[in-house]
Interface confidence: medium
């Protein structure tokens, strides 16, 4: 019996087609992805093959103005329209709190939403009961397939799930649910989840009875043969893991942003054992037409977005200096504003020892593309912020050793004075440079804001200590020459859309007046 698994993950609000790098579509003839194009391909496969499941491994939420405006209603609507069969909860599904998940998505989705390792407690338990499930048995042709869900146990550090959801260890939580499916005579089981490729592989190895793992969170691109676009494969598709009980378990992921549709064909024997698996992600490029009815629906929903982008988010009473003449040479108040917003967006998980789990921000000055003039009645709009941060990136959470941070700050000024983009703006950091010294030895003082303290204060950076830092995904991926971050980071979790982070902060503050205050000397 043959099953076709179509899968997406980390779509992050890319409802419309995008450019090849998943930013805003400029030249339509070269654009990719989007739900209208995805629907065309899905329908084509559904018509051609008998047993097809369309699955999503989480993080539909967060990433473009679509999510900012519609807050998840767009996810439910278009996933319903595409007739998804199941979805696993990702960490970003909690970005607007539990209510922001329950109302727009859990209550409106026509497909099961899954996570076996999230347990509700207290008053939330009855409110959320039945709205998401640990597993679901889906009829496919004449057979049934069990889908068990899982979500990153780091979600409390990455999003806003509140205090009434407990995120258990994935493997510990999955095993009893898989065992339960076995007792129901379900012998074909897919683990669908959002914990990253390393955890996906562990699940394949450790959870007895899981036949296939469909993952997300790490934006992993797997491919067999010559890759069709810019993404470099992290391994073959499917990636085969030998389980502890000797089975060959295929593990798949489909990069991110709806650029690819994962396509995996699995052959099962009559006892539910995987006989063979093969496939590849399908690049959703312009050779695949956009479905006209979905496209018309997208255009209809789009109208509200255009209007939103010109509405006032808040006011500034000072000039927001985002000029390259400032931000690539010295501390600029636009950089301070953005870093303050980045930290504010990550205020979570305080306890009696830590005032917050992260206190530091770094931001490449070259990523700040425009100032905002306060003389326009002080008004700040989404449109203004899109000019400042036009690349559609995210502000991510990484863990780095102090020694890596020191290298990053040396790189920041290694060719100072040439108006290059690597000059770092900061938050929760005081750095002193001596530019008379030779490149690679210019950082003379580097103090960082403590987290394990009741009164935050600046302490000297410790080379062997592990620090959490918020930074643009561009830097986490080694952009602007920050190869040491990419090579040496100990953990990387994707965060919220850059403009959304700043716009939320400005809306919260209502009136802003960031200063140049001696963070960089």
């Amino acid at each position: 019996w043959e099953l076709t698994i179509l899968h997406t993950n980390d779509v992050h609000s890319r409802l419309e087609q995008t450019s090849e790098d998943s930013s805003k579509c400029v030249n339509a003839s070269r654009c990719m992805g989007g739900v209208a194009r995805l629907f065309t391909k899905v329908q084509q496969i559904r018509r051609a093959e008998p047993n097809v499941l369309l699955l999503d491994a989480g993080d539909q939420y967060q990433g473009t103005i679509w999510f900012t405006v519609y807050k998840g209603a767009e996810v439910a609507h278009f996933m319903n329209a595409l007739r998804y069969d199941a979805m696993a909860l990702g960490n970003h599904e909690f970005d607007n709190g539990v209510e922001g998940l329950i109302e727009p998505l859990l209550k409106e989705a026509k497909f099961p939403i899954l996570s076996a390792n999230i347990k509700a407690k207290g008053p939330l338990a009855s409110q959320i009961s039945g709205l998401y499930l640990p597993y679901k048995v889906l009829p496919v042709g004449d057979e049934v397939v069990g889908i068990v869900g899982y979500t990153s146990k780091e979600t409390p550090f990455l999003s806003n799930p509140g205090t009434n959801l407990v995120f258990e260890d994935e493997i510990t939580a999955l095993q009893p649910e898989v065992d339960k499916l076995k007792t129901l005579n379900v012998n074909k089981i897919i683990a669908l989840g959002h914990s990253g490729f390393e955890t996906d592989k562990l699940i394949a190895q450790k959870v007895r009875g899981v036949d296939v793992v469909v993952g997300g969170h790490s934006n992993t691109f797997l491919y067999t043969g010559n890759p069709p676009s810019k993404e470099v494969p992290a391994g073959k598709y499917p990636f085969i893991v030998t389980s502890d009980d000797g089975r060959k378990v295929p593990v798949v992921q489909a990069y991110a942003f709806g650029k690819y549709l994962g396509y995996l064909k699995i052959e099962f024997d009559e006892r539910g054992n995987v006989i063979s698996s093969h496939g590849n992600p399908i690049l959703l490029n312009s050779s695949i037409p956009e479905d006209p009815s979905i496209k018309a629906d997208i255009n209809k929903w789009r109208i509200k977005l255009d209007n939103y982008s010109t509405q006032e988010l808040g006011k500034t009473i000072v000039y927001l200096d985002g000029s390259s003449q400032s931000c690539r040479f010295r501390e600029c108040n636009m950089g301070n504003l953005i870093c303050d917003a980045m930290i504010n967006n990550n205020l979570r998980h305080a306890d009696e020892m830590f005032w917050n789990h992260v206190s530091m921000c770094i931001l490449n000055g070259g990523g700040i593309r425009s100032p905002i003039d306060e003389r326009n009645n002080g008004t700040i709009t989404w449109e203004n912020l899109a000019a400042v941060l036009p690349f559609g990136g995210t502000f991510d959470l990484v863990q780095l050793k102090g020694s890596t941070l020191k290298k990053a700050f040396e790189h920041s000024v290694h060719r100072y004075g040439q108006s290059t983009g690597e000059f770092l703006q900061v938050g929760g950091i005081h750095v002193v440079y001596d530019l008379s010294r030779k490149p690679g030895d210019r950082v003379v003082k580097l103090d960082v804001l403590c987290t394990k303290c009741r009164v935050p204060s600046y302490d000297p950076l410790k080379m062997d200590e592990i620090y959490k830092v918020i930074l643009p995904n561009f830097l986490a991926n080694g952009g602007d020459g920050f190869q040491m971050i990419k090579d040496e980071l100990l953990r990387h979790d994707s965060g919220d859309q850059d403009i959304n982070v700043v716009s939320t902060y400005i809306s919260k503050m209502k009136v802003i007046y960031p200063a140049v205050e001696g963070r960089i000397k």
């Epitope: 767009e74 109302e103 727009p104 989705a109 026509k110 109208i303």
Partner: antibody, heavy 124, light 106 residues
Framework: EVQLLESGGGLVQPGGSLRLSCAAS????????MSWVRQAPGKGLEWVSA????????YYADSVKGRFTISRDNSKNTLYLQMNSLRAEDTAVYYC?????????????????WGQGTLVTVSS | EIVMTQSPATLSVSPGERATLSCRAS??????LAWYQQKPGQAPRLLIY???TRATGIPARFSGSGSGTEFTLTISSLQSEDFAVYYC????????FGGGTKVEIK
Amino acid sequence: EVQLLESGGGLVQPGGSLRLSCAASGFTFSNLAMSWVRQAPGKGLEWVSAISGRATSTYYADSVKGRFTISRDNSKNTLYLQMNSLRAEDTAVYYCARGGPYGSGSYWDTFDYWGQGTLVTVSS
Amino acid sequence: EIVMTQSPATLSVSPGERATLSCRASQSVSSNLAWYQQKPGQAPRLLIYGASTRATGIPARFSGSGSGTEFTLTISSLQSEDFAVYYCQQYTNHYTFGGGTKVEIK
């Protein structure tokens, strides 16, 4: 082809009840929000009630709140309006229309398809 | 409640002429405004949504404009089949319709 067909209208005395139905075809009914709109003889249009695709959210005009109940049976592709405590001013043609709230009302859609309407007359 | 006011109540126009219908909202509805056409004995038909986007199958002679509180429906050259009642509708917060404008033959 999208079709909406209302039924259940008629003459009813003040204080009485009536249940309207709207049979939908030609689209995935459960994906879409639905509404009721009425039009008194010789008058303009008045929105009455709306329901989300999975019936998790319902909305009513103030003039009918507490008296009318909107519901849907997605397995039968049918929308309903239960009207109780009817008054003379409820006399109208009642239209079923495709469109309404999504995501608990964060997005309201326009009415792109309408039924032909069913006449409700409240008179003694 | 958002109140929608249409003017004029009746508009007398000769075939081939231009007709301009107005709709005013009591508070801003952004671009969440639709126009419907209704002929005697028929259900309304969606013409324009998003203040200016023509619905599927609607001829180009119908155009909408405006945002916030002031909106206009223009029929560039009236055809015989265009004589009808036109309603505006806001859909920012639930729904409210205007009282209608009857376009009649002059």
